[in-house]
């Protein structure tokens, strides 16, 4: 539960909670905004980046996001929190404790985005589709 | 029983350095994830800065990367956190806190010390 020493809300800036009224802790998200990559045409891919991060708000999740152009493929991983869009997309998986990279439509380019909440989830990040629950024959797997 | 007790706290000017110490007693230290939080006045918490065990692996918040250092001396049931190029934004109550799973998954059990207030102003 929450200390009684430590301030609850001050300027609505809450102490977040869980269920059980204990204070949440942040996750751990690998954090190294955008780098390029050599990510191309994998299963998965590690994230080759050496800056693992302690989110700022408990709230947040691990997002990958992958780009390819006729100039170059970047791979940036960051915090965001699940609430508020990212690149102008909501973060669907969020709850997921891996990072299924899913293609979103982005004029002249090829855009994948991901997001999970286990600790250094971004890490790796997959490309695969059968690990991809929009697969209706996995959907149909997992509900026999 | 549980006791964790932060001590270092003060003023320093900015640019200036301070060593935070947590002693720990009640429970086996040395197997413990340990954090350092802080709550600057009229703020939430910001969790600045976690160590694991066994291993010691070390975690650090963006705002405080490069600056401060978690460690631990498990002979002497202590955490530690240097901290450097303090800022006056660094000002807050810090406190130290440890984590452990319940054996439920995604649950936890946490332990808070009083806090310590550190200062940056010149």
């Known amino acids: 539960t929450i200390p009684p020493h430590v301030q609850k809300s001050v300027n609505n800036d809450m102490i977040v909670t869980d269920n059980n009224g204990a204070v949440k802790f942040p996750q751990l998200c690998k954090f190294c905004d955008v780098r390029f990559s050599t990510c191309d045409n994998q299963k998965s891919c590690m994230s080759n980046c050496s800056i693992t991060s302690i989110c700022e708000k408990p709230q947040e999740v691990c997002v990958a996001v992958w780009r390819k152009n006729d100039e170059n493929i970047t791979l940036e991983t960051v915090c965001h929190d699940p609430k508020l869009p990212y690149h102008d997309f909501i973060l669907e998986d969020a709850a997921s404790p891996k990072c299924i990279m899913k293609e979103k439509k982005k004029p002249g380019e090829t855009f994948f985005m991901c997001s999970c909440s286990s600790d250094e989830c971004n890490d790796n990040i997959i490309f695969s589709e059968e690990y991809n629950t929009s697969n209706p024959d996995l959907l149909l797997v997992i509900f026999q | 029983e549980v006791q964790l007790l932060e001590s270092g706290g003060g003023l320093v000017q900015p640019g200036g350095s301070l060593r935070l110490s947590c002693a720990a007693s009640?429970?086996?230290?040395?197997?413990?994830q340990m954090w350092w939080v802080r709550q600057a006045p009229g703020k939430g918490l910001e969790f600045i800065s976690?160590?694991?065990?066994?291993?010691?692996?070390?975690y650090y918040a963006n705002s405080v990367r490069g600056r401060f250092t978690i460690s631990r001396d498990n002979s002497k049931n202590t955490l530690y956190l240097q901290m450097n190029s303090l800022r006056a934004e660094d000002t807050a109550v810090y406190y130290c806190?440890?984590?452990?799973?319940?054996?439920?998954?995604?649950?936890?059990?946490?332990?808070w010390g009083q806090g310590t207030l550190v200062t940056v102003s010149s």
């Open positions: 009640g429970f086996t230290f040395g197997t413990e």
């Open positions: 806190a440890k984590r452990r799973p319940t054996g439920v998954s995604g649950t936890f059990y946490d332990y």
């Open positions: 976690r160590i694991d065990s066994p291993g010691g692996r070390t």
